[in-house]
């Protein structure tokens, strides 16, 4: 009778992460008597994957009933495959021995490769807000994909951006990879409603590319413009002075009226009106009693927007 051969018919197997890998192995003879073991890798550092005789291998099931006397099919299934399972798997026949079984013959090996989808891209912007005309950086990260080939694009409101740098790590061979990209975006006053999108395409994706988004409303600060105007003199010597606070974002704003440098009133923006571009307008008014003043009055509208240093606009009220 011919000497037993261990046949692993598949040189290579490709499996999607999360699926089950079937590693096929058959023996050509029932002799010699002894168990089969599966290993990942070869040599002294090889990793035991399955032992027919003993041990607990929760992810591994056998294709055939190995307890049957005439069984020569030693194929196994490994469940819930991850990229970390990639490697070459060997089906090894042992001869019954005392005290230990002795390795008799190994199959040629089956290389298991794993394809894994990239994680949903996460886009993060700068920690602090910035004003129009400034350039800000956005980062995009996606992890856990294999193979390494991946494309990443940046868009602002549907327009593709070109000023970005992308790295895929690690540079060498790995079971899975990560991508990290940084894009530079110049802010404009109209960007409150704008979105920055990072788009990742990979061979494993059956749908459109994965997208991560960042709203520029979380990044931009549009400082207000101020205009102080005096309304016609009303009855009882009262003058109505208004401070128009226009085109600001975000809404957080505090306004202080000063009469000749002295605080007259402080209020917080509440009933604002929203512009089409997402910025806000607000108006505050002050009634000034002209008869209480002998000299001209300097009225100042002072605005502190989003914790920034105050900006102000003054108006000289003529007392005639």
């Amino acid at each position: 009778e011919e000497e037993l051969q261990v046949i692993q018919p598949d040189k290579s197997v490709l499996v999607a992460a999360g699926e089950t890998a079937t590693l096929r192995c058959t023996a050509t003879s029932l002799i010699p008597v002894g168990p089969i073991q599966w290993f990942r890798g070869a040599g002294p550092g090889r990793e035991l994957i399955y032992n027919q005789k003993e041990g607990h291998f929760p992810r591994v099931t056998t294709v055939s009933d190995l307890t049957k006397r005439n069984n020569m099919d030693f194929s196994i299934r490994i469940g819930n495959i991850t990229p970390a399972d990639a490697g070459t798997y060997y089906c090894v026949k042992f001869r019954k021995g005392s005290p230990d079984d002795v390795e008799f013959k190994s199959g040629a090996g089956t290389e298991l490769s794993v394809r894994a989808k990239p994680s949903a891209p996460v886009v993060s912007g700068p920690a602090a807000r910035a004003t129009p005309q400034h350039t800000v950086s956005f980062t995009c990260e996606s992890h856990g994909f294999s193979p390494r080939d991946i494309t990443l694009k940046w868009f602002k409101n549907g327009n593709e951006l070109s000023d970005f740098q992308t790295n895929v790590d690690p540079v060498g061979e790995s079971v899975s990879y990560s991508i990290h990209s940084t894009a530079k975006v110049v802010l404009t006053r109209e960007d409150v409603h704008s979105q920055v999108i990072c788009e990742v395409a990979h061979v494993t994706l059956q749908g459109d590319p994965l997208r991560g988004t960042a709203n520029l409303s979380e990044t931009i600060r549009v400082p207000p413009t101020l205009e102080v105007t005096q309304q016609p003199v009303r009855a009882e010597n009262q003058v109505n002075v208004t401070c128009q606070v226009r085109k600001f974002y975000p809404q957080r704003l505090q306004l202080t009226w000063l009469e000749n440098g002295n605080v007259s009133r402080t209020e917080t923006a509440s009933t604002v009106t929203e512009n089409k571009d997402g910025t806000y307008n607000w108006m505050s008014w002050l009634l000034v009693n002209v008869s209480a003043h002998r000299d001209d009055v300097k009225l100042t509208c002072q605005v502190e927007h989003d914790g920034q240093p105050a900006v102000s606009k003054s108006h000289d009220l003529k007392v005639s």
């Epitope: 999607a16 394809r115 080939d149 991946i150 990979h202 061979v203 494993t204 059956q206 749908g207």
Partner: antibody, heavy 116, light 109 residues
């Protein structure tokens, strides 16, 4: 799991024609699907794909001549204005479960003949 | 667009022969290459995907190798049912587009 094309016929130059691809055993919302064609005695030519979410992508030569769309059970190829060079067998196919780089399920094809 | 050049365009061989078909891409496609078999009046059938992986149900006499720009389909021992036309097909991960080789017709000698 299978796919099958229909709608192939004799058509006149300049007229529109719509081919359909009906799938069974799997959902169109889970896989990329593709259209291909093969002129008599010639090789295979890629036309375009539609993603699982319904976005179409076309070969560069298509130039708006064809439109790919889908419903829950069928994928369509609309040929806007037939030309004689469109005479071919048209195949639809599904990409493999491991990725979009290969097609593992093909229909038998449907013949389109363009002649006046 | 990527061009795929298949060679030879046709070959004559006998049952039992070892047959090799090559496919060259005009730029690197890494391992994104598939091989199909097509018989007259029939749809293509997938043989090999990702350059070297044998599709389920395909006899083990078919094998694929290569990466980058140069790829090979080998039939180790030609059988009567293997007489057909064979196509390579690439997928480019940047353009996300597909290209076929022009085909290789394997005929009986």
């Amino acid at each position: 799991q299978s796919v099958e094309e229909s709608g192939g016929r004799l058509g006149q130059p300049g007229t529109p024609l719509t081919l359909s691809c009906t799938v069974s055993g799997f959902s169109l919302s889970s896989y990329v699907m593709g259209w291909f064609r093969q002129a008599p005695g010639k090789g295979l030519e890629y036309i375009g794909i539609i993603s699982s979410s319904g976005s179409p992508y076309y070969a560069s030569w298509v130039n708006g001549r064809f439109t790919i769309s889908k419903t829950s059970t069928t994928m369509d190829l609309k040929m806007n204005s037939l030309r004689s060079e469109d005479t071919a067998t048209y195949f639809c196919a599904r990409v493999g479960p491991l990725g979009v780089d290969y097609f593992n399920i093909w229909g038998p094809g449907t013949l389109v003949t363009v002649s006046s | 667009d990527i061009q795929m050049t298949q060679s030879p365009s046709s070959l004559s061989a006998s049952v039992g022969d070892r047959v090799t078909i090559t496919c060259r891409a005009s730029q690197s496609i890494n391992s994104y290459l598939a091989w199909y078999q097509q018989k007259p009046g029939k749809a293509p059938k997938l043989l090999i995907y990702s350059a070297s992986f044998l599709y389920s149900g395909v006899p083990s006499r078919f094998s694929g190798s290569g990466s980058g720009t140069d790829f090979t389909l080998t039939i180790s021992s030609l059988q009567p049912e293997d007489f057909a036309t064979y196509y390579c097909q690439s997928w480019h991960y940047i353009s996300r587009s597909y290209t076929f080789g022009q085909g290789t017709k394997v005929e009986i000698k």
